[in-house]
């Protein structure tokens, strides 16, 4: 609550507004008869600064010299103590401090286009808390001067609501800001400049690009820009890189060519100009262009790689299959792939164009020396074409890479490792690594994916469509020439103990044995590359241990004789499959009875 | 921030006095001090009194005794009671006040009143 004085008097000097570390004068005073009991040496008058006792006086007044106050406001009260009674308020003040302006710094001036105003701006220094006026002053030649003011606590900007003129760009202007408050007053050094010193031009607009002949090395950026532009830099970059290529042109006249954009990239472009060599400030960026340069035949070439199968006596299966160009290649949507299939002793050929996939399969006479080409078309034309004679990749056994393994290596990778062929290794061009996923049934619409090693490489490192608890058929190819050998491993980047066991779907009986046939385990239920079956049986209603038969696994295999079987006995038969994690529960479970007569 | 309108000046003998009055509008919430300042022709402008919100005053040396400065809280409202008038209290009489915004203070000024005083 403001008290309203009405028993004494509180004054100050020299204000209630002081400089940071000056001193301040307080004295309160008691009005008369507002004392103890009309008695003035009973009179006890104390000064508080917030709520600690400061000063006290006994009688009439009190005079307190006050120093070493705050920034911002102190409260003082002044009250009256006498004798069996509570303190009573005479009459309160509140100091508030500040500082007087520092001097404004980096006063810096801009007009933003030849047809814009002059605006400075500063460094306020160290808040005054204070309000502060600050005024502007521009003179010029011929004695002209203009005047702007702000009061603002916060002010570090004005404009002039002035455009200076190019007529004659060498005359000196010259601007400085005053701070005046309460407190004090000071002023910035003073900035002298020309126009050409303080224009900056607007950004260039309406840029655009053309492509002579729809030719990305013949490319020419089009903008305008206002009339004293003497300088102009560009920059440019793919859209989708960080990195910008710059480049400074001069008395450029609106228009540059550029000779070294990559075809089929979106770029951004944008352009800033300067009136003078060495005077003045760059305009802001334009605004982006984003312009896709045009296409231009492919470069490099396919990687092909193909699979073989034997149909029957007369015919086998060829796929094909490529990666696609890497968009520096394919410089260009690429519209469909050209296979050509020939028979090299015959001369028969066949081309077709495949949109829409990269593999091929079709279907030729198991006599005679195939080969195929595979090129990639944009609408600028095409690639070169990758040639390879068809043979069978597996064929020389003394090429067979030698001690093929494969191991888990993080996640998602598996480590491919060999060691060189017998045969002379430094026949050996390359090594292909192949895999796939594995599938009982031997699917050949599976997705093959391979890589190609140097010949002195005997490791690879497979990451690309690598899923965890994926069993794969990895193989390792050694190329010579017109001969191949091949080793084949499965592999897995990441396994856990199988989510079943095999499924018994039949037991039969053949001269006092028995044949054992399972369906396979679901590819997902497997969780990695399968190691072993194992066949379990035990008389039914026995507590023995049951006994086992351990098979390797072979992706082909369903089925198992056993001959350990006593005959008129009823045996519970199951079972389980294991990966190097651990073994899957029980398959389901059967009863068999063998008719037979004991061996 | 708050507008200020000073009414009360005119001409008057030495050793007669006015009564000045100053009114706070707008949004006139913590007014922290109100003061008068006066300008002679051709000099600086120099403070005359001031008041706290809380009923402290603050007066030049030069009429410390023949003004008197007051001020209604509630109704926004700064008197200076000036006894004793001589020629060179003649001026403009302008009323600030000091408004708190966030840690600082800020300023606002009325337009002024003309105070003459004959001999």
């Known amino acids: 609550k403001i008290d309203a004085c009405k028993r004494g008097d509180v004054t100050v000097k020299p204000s209630h507004v002081i400089l940071l570390g000056s001193t301040v004068n307080i004295t309160c005073s008691l009005k008369p008869r507002q004392g103890c009991f009309h008695y003035s040496r009973r009179n006890k008058l104390i000064l508080y600064k917030f709520d600690r006792r400061i000063n006290f006086h006994h009688g009439h007044s009190l005079n307190s010299q006050v120093t070493g106050l705050p920034l911002g406001t102190t409260l003082f009260v002044c009250k009256l103590a006498c004798i069996n009674s509570d303190e009573i308020q005479i009459c309160g003040a509140e100091i508030f401090v500040g500082v007087a302006p520092e001097q404004p710094q980096n006063l810096s001036c801009i007009q933003k286009g030849e047809q814009g105003t002059v605006a400075c701006t500063w460094e306020r220094g160290r808040d005054t808390h204070l309000y502060t006026e600050y005024t502007l002053q521009l003179s010029g030649p011929k004695n002209l001067t203009w005047q702007k003011q702000c009061k603002d606590i916060y002010c570090d900007y004005l404009d002039f609501g002035i455009n200076l003129t190019p007529e004659s760009p060498e005359s000196n202007f010259t601007a400085k800001v005053t701070a005046v408050n309460s407190l004090g007053s000071s002023s910035s050094l003073p900035s002298t400049f020309t126009f050409l010193d303080i224009v900056r031009p607007l950004p260039p607009w309406d840029i655009r690009i053309k492509f002579q002949k729809a030719s990305v090395s013949r490319c020419t950026l089009y903008w305008r820009d206002e009339g004293l532009v003497l300088l102009n830099r560009l920059r440019y970059r793919p859209s989708n890189s960080r990195l910008w290529n710059m480049v400074n042109v001069t008395k450029a006249k609106g228009r540059h060519d550029l000779l070294d954009l990559k075809p089929f990239t979106e770029y951004e472009f944008q352009i800033s100009s300067k009136l003078h060599l060495y005077k003045g400030s760059w305009s802001d960026w334009s605004e982006s262009l984003r312009a896709q340069t045009p296409e231009e035949e492919p470069t490099g070439m396919l990687d092909v790689w193909y699979m073989k199968r034997h149909i029957d006596y007369s015919r086998q299966q060829i796929s094909l299959f490529w990666k696609n160009l890497s968009v520096s290649e394919a410089r260009g949507k690429i519209l469909h792939y050209q296979v050509t299939l020939q028979e090299l002793t015959g001369g028969k050929a066949m081309t077709q164009n495949i949109t829409g996939h990269t593999s091929w399969t079709t279907v030729i006479p198991r006599t005679g020396n195939w080969a195929v080409a595979v090129s990639a078309a944009n609408s600028k034309g095409s690639s070169l074409p990758t040639r390879i004679n068809i043979m069978n990749l597996c064929e020389a056994g003394l090429l067979a890479p030698r001690q093929v393994s494969a191991n888990s290596e993080g996640m998602d990778n598996i480590l491919v490792t060999w060691q060189p062929p017998r045969k002379d290794p430094s026949a050996v061009q390359e090594y292909v690594v192949e895999w796939r996923e594995l599938h009982p049934g031997g699917d050949t619409q599976v997705p093959l994916n391979w890589l190609r090693s140097r010949p002195y490489n005997v490791s690879a490192l497979i990451s690309e469509n690598i899923k965890s608890y994926i069993c794969y058929e990895i193989r390792v190819y050694a190329l010579s020439g017109d001969q191949g050998g091949c080793s084949s491993i499965l592999g897995n980047s990441k396994h856990k103990a199988p989510l079943s066991g095999p499924h018994i779907n039949a037991i039969t009986e053949e001269k006092g044995s028995i044949l054992i046939s399972w369906n396979s385990i679901p590819v997902q239920e497997q969780m990695g590359c399968l190691l072993h079956y194992r066949i379990y049986w035990k008389e039914r209603d026995s507590n023995s241990q049951p006994q086992l038969c351990e098979i390797p696994y072979r992706v082909s295999q369903n089925s198992h004789p056993i001959n350990s079987l006593q005959p008129r006995v009823t045996y519970v038969l199951w079972m389980t499959a294991l990966t190097a994690a651990g073994e899957s529960s029980h398959g389901n479970e059967r009863e068999f009875c063998l008719q037979g007569k004991a061996n | 921030q708050v507008q200020l309108q000073e009414s009360g000046g005119g001409l008057v003998q030495a050793g007669g006095s006015l009564r000045l009055t100053c009114t706070a509008s707008?949004?006139?919430?913590?007014?922290?001090?109100m003061s008068w300042y006066r300008q002679a022709p051709g000099k600086q402008r120099e403070l005359v009194a001031e008041?706290?919100?809380?009923?402290?005053?603050t007066y030049a040396d030069s009429v410390e005794g023949r003004f008197t400065i007051s001020r209604d809280n509630a109704k926004n409202i700064v008197d200076l009671q000036m006894n004793s008038l001589k020629p060179e209290d003649t001026a403009v009489y302008y009323c600030?006040?000091?408004?708190?915004?966030?840690?600082?203070?800020?300023?606002?000024w009325g337009r002024g009143t003309q105070v003459t005083v004959s001999s």
């Open positions: 707008g949004s006139a919430a913590l007014i922290f001090l």
């Open positions: 008041v706290s919100r809380r009923g402290s005053t």
């Open positions: 600030k006040a000091d408004q708190y915004y966030g840690d600082s203070l800020r300023s606002s």
